[in-house]
């Protein structure tokens, strides 16, 4: 099957800060040097880019500084990090990865990862 | 709203060159890889060529490659396609089209016609 | 390559009748990377199916997908007099993109 299969965990629970945390993993059907990592949401049809990164086989990804995204990478398995959410971005989050370098091109997309995000209570005012 | 408009299409001897631009709007073009798809007259749908993001990866179909170079300009929203050498058989509506974020072709221009005729 | 391969290369139907349009991949194929796209005389491809079996934004729910492996599927309800056009498979999940030689679906 000329495809690249690309595996994430059905759900995650983002921590009462905002953060999720979640590994992408990749089967990759040639030897790449040059590999894009994107996040993506989709919520009813629609499909949106949270965040990006490109980086060379053995070298470390890097999101843009502004990313709300950051990244480790260990040979065909990316660990992915999203912070600063709210209940209102749970949602599926699908992994999607390029082999950008050497042709032929691959495109593997991921089933996605439900993130729950919570909302912590704030705390009551304290009478003394 | 998404919107990509084509030019610089006409009529050309065969072994000249032509250059074709495509003006993108309403998204964020740096985002999204972008491809030439070409029509013959009477005839299907053909791949061209393809450019990623920052305009560094770029791929192209055997029947083109070395005589076509495509090309972007993140900052003016524009895409090209240098055509050299051109033949008889690139006669052609090409038209540019945005690869989606999962994978297929969401938005078209309106196709720009190439005649490579003596 | 993936080639791929559709049938009928013209389907003649009235308006009101169901219409079956097959693809079919040179080699096994992910649903993920399967495209159905909708062609009228003059005009611009549109997406109309993506990953097999998703609707593009705006396309009624009278057009459906499906399929897996080597044998894919585009299936109209109903046909609308809108409807009549040639319709493309491509599969993009990986160079070279690849498209069949399209199905024109015309009035009986």
């Known amino acids: 099957c000329k495809a690249m299969h690309v595996a994430q965990p059905a759900v995650v629970l983002a921590s009462s800060r905002g953060i999720a945390s979640f590994v992408c993993e990749y089967a990759s059907p040639g030897k790449a040097t040059e590999v894009r990592v994107t996040v993506l949401r989709q919520a009813d049809s629609q499909v949106t880019e949270v965040c990006a990164a490109t980086y060379m086989m053995g070298n470390e990804l890097t999101f843009l500084d502004d990313s709300i995204c950051t990244g480790t990478s260990s040979g065909n398995q990316v660990n992915l990090t999203i912070q600063g959410l709210r209940a209102m971005d749970t949602g599926l989050y699908i992994c999607k990865v390029e082999l950008m370098y050497p042709p032929p091109y691959y495109l593997g997309i991921g089933n996605g990862t439900q993130i729950y995000v919570i909302d912590p209570e704030p705390c009551p005012d304290s009478d003394f | 709203q998404v919107q990509l408009v084509e030019s610089g299409g006409g009529v050309v001897q065969p072994g000249r060159s032509l250059r074709l631009s495509c003006a993108a709007s309403g998204f964020t073009f740096s985002s999204y890889g972008m491809h030439w798809v070409r029509q013959a007259p009477g005839k299907g749908l053909e791949w061209v060529a393809v450019i990623w993001y920052d305009g560094r990866n770029k791929y192209y179909a055997d029947s083109v490659k070395g005589r076509f170079t495509i090309s972007r300009d993140n900052s003016k929203n524009t895409l090209d396609l240098q055509m050299n050498s051109l033949r008889a058989e690139d006669t052609a509506v090409y038209y540019c089209?945005?690869?989606?974020?999962?994978?297929?072709?969401?938005?078209w221009g309106q196709g720009t016609l190439v005649t490579v005729s003596s | 390559e993936i080639v791929l391969t559709q049938s009928p290369g013209t389907l003649s139907l009235s308006p009101g009748e169901r219409a079956t349009l097959s693809c079919r991949a040179s080699q096994s194929v992910s649903s993920s990377y399967l495209a159905w796209y909708q062609q009228k005389p003059g005009q611009a491809p549109r997406l109309l199916i993506y990953?097999?079996?998703s609707r593009a934004t705006g396309i009624p729910d009278r057009f459906s997908g499906s399929g897996s492996g080597t044998d894919f599927t585009l299936t109209i309800s109903r046909l609308e007099p809108e409807d009549f056009a040639v319709y493309y498979c491509?599969?993009?999940?990986?160079?070279?993109?690849?498209f069949g030689q399209g199905t024109k679906v015309e009035i009986k």
């Open positions: 491509q599969h993009y999940g990986s160079s070279p993109w690849t």
């Open positions: 990953g097999a079996s």
């Open positions: 089209a945005r690869n989606q974020p999962l994978g297929s072709f969401d938005y």
